[in-house]
């Protein structure tokens, strides 16, 4: 006999990176017929929702009107059908951004390079932080973590045209509190590649969707969160 129900999906709309004082909605999708959903924050019960009518609803939303550092952290949800509870969802890392300062992002040797040249990004923030994150715009995206007292290096190695794009970085004060984003740096990679072995080893993280972060409260742009399965958030762990 089945002891638990399948775990629900959890995600944040419009994005798991939330500028401070902005709104965010945590969504939990379980099954039709669920009579109760519980949202847990850092291991403790945070909120409860009982959908009506349960047989016509398979998703609930927990609204946070004013994001701040106290609300940033790890969320999970569970649901109940009758007396049977589900497995807990994956953990959702909700990050507050636009905290304190703005880092500076630069790239060496420059923003325009030839395919095959070695490229290194530098993210600098003079206030006290030791962790930095480099993000590339778009659905197919690199997310890298770097460390340093005031500056982190992000060596991309020999680049290909797959590395073309717009990059930004954050300083991270802890796993769930990030700085303002840096100004964007657009990397242009020119030249035809003859050596296909130069393709990046790990060219994509399907999670980044930086574009949705930029459009947080202006458009309420949505994406199919169930597809990306929290890859970027795994970076935080």
């Amino acid at each position: 006999q089945q002891q638990t129900l399948p775990k629900p999906f959890i995600w944040a709309e419009p994005h798991f990176m939330v500028p401070k004082e902005k709104q965010v909605t945590i969504c939990c999708q379980g099954n039709y017929g669920a009579v109760e959903y519980q949202l847990h924050f850092e291991g403790s019960l945070f909120a409860v929702d009982r959908p009506k009518p349960p047989e016509r609803i398979n998703k609930v939303q927990f609204y946070i009107p004013d994001m701040n550092s106290r609300m940033a952290g790890q969320y999970s949800c569970i649901y109940r059908v009758g007396e049977l509870w589900s497995e807990p969802s994956n953990l959702l890392d909700l990050v507050v951004t636009e905290m304190y300062d703005t880092p500076t992002l630069s790239v060496h040797p420059g923003p325009e390079v030839i395919s095959g040249e070695k490229v290194t990004f530098y993210c600098r923030l003079d206030t006290a932080t030791s962790m930095f994150l480099l993000l590339k715009e778009g659905r197919s995206s690199h997310v890298q973590r770097g460390y340093g007292k005031v500056q982190a290096e992000f060596p991309l190695g020999p680049v290909t045209t797959a590395h073309r794009g717009t990059y930004r970085c954050f300083g991270s004060y802890n796993n769930h509190a990030w700085s303002f984003p840096s100004e964007p740096v657009k990397l242009l990679v020119t030249g035809d590649i003859e050596n296909t072995s130069l393709a990046p080893e790990d060219p994509t993280f399907p999670a980044d969707t930086w574009g949705t972060y930029l459009l947080t409260t202006e458009t309420g742009l949505q994406k199919d969160h169930a597809l990306w399965d929290h890859t970027a958030q795994n970076l935080l762990r």
Partner: antibody, heavy 118, light 107 residues
């Protein structure tokens, strides 16, 4: 010690081609892109183009595109610059220069004088 | 293309004097600006990278400043071997472009 040794001076007729070589030593050839810069008599420096020996990827100054060809021979750690359909305005000293990935052109060849004259 | 301009075209100074050379880009290039020195019948030599960063082996009297589109190379006290032509270079985007040069000669 990093060295870039260029081939000797050339005198060419208008309409012909010239190929200048740049033999490198003292570093890993494939790790740095090689660029070519020319300098007409009494004039400033003009970037010609660059090539990554690692990939064979190239970037050319559009002013020379179609007439210029940059190549490398990895086995001999040598870069080549070929310019076709020469005209008198191409008379210049041609330099090869290594582009460091943490700065700019950090090592230069001694220069090759190309004279185009009928 | 990014056009680099330099001023003055010629700077006549005596040894021991301070030299201030200017370079302007036709659009913002952040700090992707490099300075080169060239003496007659010699290849150029990299002096300053990324507007203000020093290069190993280059005397400390050479310094750079600026960001965006306006840059300065300063030679704090001219030595006899510093009389040469100085070029700034756009390292931001292709085509990589050089300024017309500033000639520093002996007064």
């Amino acid at each position: 010690e990093v060295q870039l040794q260029q081939s000797g001076a050339e005198v060419k007729k208008p309409g012909s081609s010239v190929k200048v070589s740049c033999k490198t030593s003292g570093y890993t050839f494939t790790e740095y892109s090689m660029h070519w810069v020319r300098q007409a008599p009494g004039k400033s420096l003009e970037w010609f183009g660059g090539i990554s020996p690692n990939s064979g990827g190239t970037s050319y100054n559009q002013k020379f595109k179609g007439r210029a060809t940059l190549t490398v021979d990895k086995s001999s750690s040598t870069a080549y610059m070929e310019l076709s359909s020469l005209r008198s305005e191409d008379t210049a000293v041609y330099y090869c220069a290594r582009r460091d990935f943490h700065s700019s052109f950090d090592y230069w060849g001694q220069g090759t004088t190309v004279t185009v004259s009928s | 293309d990014i056009v680099m301009t330099q001023s003055p075209a010629t700077l006549s100074l005596s040894p021991g004097e301070r030299a201030t050379l200017s370079c302007r880009a036709s659009q913002s290039i952040s700090d992707y600006l490099h300075w080169f020195q060239q003496k007659p019948h010699e290849s150029p030599r990299l002096l300053i990278k990324y507007a203000s960063q020093s290069i190993s082996g280059i005397p400390a009297r050479f310094s750079g400043s600026g960001s965006g589109s306006d840059f300065t190379l300063t030679i704090s006290s001219l030595e006899p071997e510093d009389f040469a032509v100085y070029y700034c270079q756009n390292g931001h985007s292709f085509p990589l472009t050089f300024g017309p040069g500033t000639k520093v000669d002996i007064k």
